[in-house]
């Protein structure tokens, strides 16, 4: 028997992926475990193998179909179970009735690019990836810019309260190297959380013109 506290957290990316993390204190070391997804009103079910991410936690991705296919709706409830092998049988270690559109975490934004750069400002655009058409324009973004000599944690957060896939960064220093990241979150969902941060985009502002203050 396994003692200790167990935590089983899953998020839906709004299209065809449910990512899960299972943590177990006093966990089993050499046991094979998996997550099993059983929707209440679909003809399919899906399984993924839990792989260790730390000493007491495991993760896996339930791939429900093609990346941009709408595999679940807001009416679906999915029974998610953690099953671990005990000899010849499987034991249920954790279970939850999962409402996909109450537990959203979208994929990180992609295709970041500099649209236009000047001495003091830079216009950057990005795209959202594998996000359901359900959201229409009801998404919000957070962005941050890494300045020289600072850490990401120190970077102030810029909030975009609408589906705006670009930003104009102002009051930058000329001829300076910066990095930029953005993340996205739908308004829908009681337990919805921010996507991971995008891959950083590096850019450099233009040097100030000699003898001029631009």
């Amino acid at each position: 028997a396994v003692n200790g506290t167990s935590q089983f957290t899953c998020f839906y990316n709004s299209r065809a992926n449910i990512s899960c993390v299972w943590s177990q204190d006093g966990a089993l070391q050499d046991t094979s475990c998996q997550v099993h997804a059983w929707p209440d009103r679909r003809r399919w079910n899906q399984t993924c193998e839990l792989l260790p991410v730390s000493q007491a936690s495991w993760a896996c991705n339930l791939i429900l179909g093609a990346p941009d296919s709408q595999k679940l709706t807001t009416v679906d409830i999915v029974t998610l179970r953690v099953l671990c092998r005990e000899g010849v049988r499987w034991r249920v270690m954790a279970i939850q009735d999962f409402k996909p559109f109450e537990n959203l975490r979208l994929m990180a934004p992609i295709s970041l690019q500099v649209v236009h750069v000047e001495t003091h400002r830079c216009n950057i655009s990005w795209e959202i990836s594998q996000a359901s058409h359900y959201f229409e324009r009801h998404l919000e973004f957070e962005a941050r810019t890494l300045s020289p000599g600072h850490t990401w944690e120190e970077a102030p957060l810029l909030t975009l309260k609408q589906k705006q896939e670009w930003i104009c960064l102002e009051t930058l220093t000329p001829d300076t190297q910066y990095e930029f990241q953005v993340r996205v979150k739908p308004l829908q969902g009681e337990f919805t959380t921010w996507s991971p941060w995008s891959q950083p985009l590096a850019f450099r502002t233009k040097p100030a013109a000699l003898g001029k203050d631009t």
């Epitope: 709706t73 807001t74 009416v75 109450e102 058409h133 359900y134 229409e136 829908q188 009681e190």
Partner: antibody, heavy 117, light 107 residues
Amino acid sequence: EVQLVQSGAEVKKPGATVKISCKVSGFNFKESLMHWVQQAPGKGLEWMGWIDSENGETEYAPGFQDRVTITADTSTDTAYMELSSLRSEDTAVYYCARGGPWFLSYWGQGTTVTVSS
Amino acid sequence: EIVMTQSPATLSVSPGERATLSCRASQIISNNLHWYQQKPGQAPRLLIIYGLQSISGIPARFSGSRSGTEFTLTISSLQSEDFAVYYCQQSNNWPWTFGQGTKLEIK
């Protein structure tokens, strides 16, 4: 500009079937959910169901699922709602609307259906 | 099916004054509550989503709030065009359901 234009008023006999159309413009119909809502006098607003034009999936409210069929023609950007076995209490204004699954962002002008012998 | 109860059924307020409309859910619906305005002979119009998020193009005098299963729509200073019927709608449990409406009339 987003527009949803519904077909005209209908008078039907009890037991008959009515089919209402909703022609849309100003947005990508193939990436939209199209909903139908009934507003009967004294009964208020009732959600009938929706169709996801992207994949053709439908969702019907339990109170209507035996009698309603929602379809979408992506070649003409038109949604349809068919209600069968009509009875007098189906006398109402029927609205098509566009939105995510959770709320209705844009509405048609409404179609009045009168069921009378 | 979740029952949405709006109160009062009719509210009489003078132009320029504040109007407070209430909507209560029969069970917990998180923030899955949306507000619409309907004028005579017209389709409803979406005002507020998720209890408190204003829709773009809706005047700032419209605001929403939540306390448990009770939701409030506040119109801070009533204009003549605000007199209409207001509906709340839940999207927590299918089928989504509407309240019976509050008629806001000129005092």
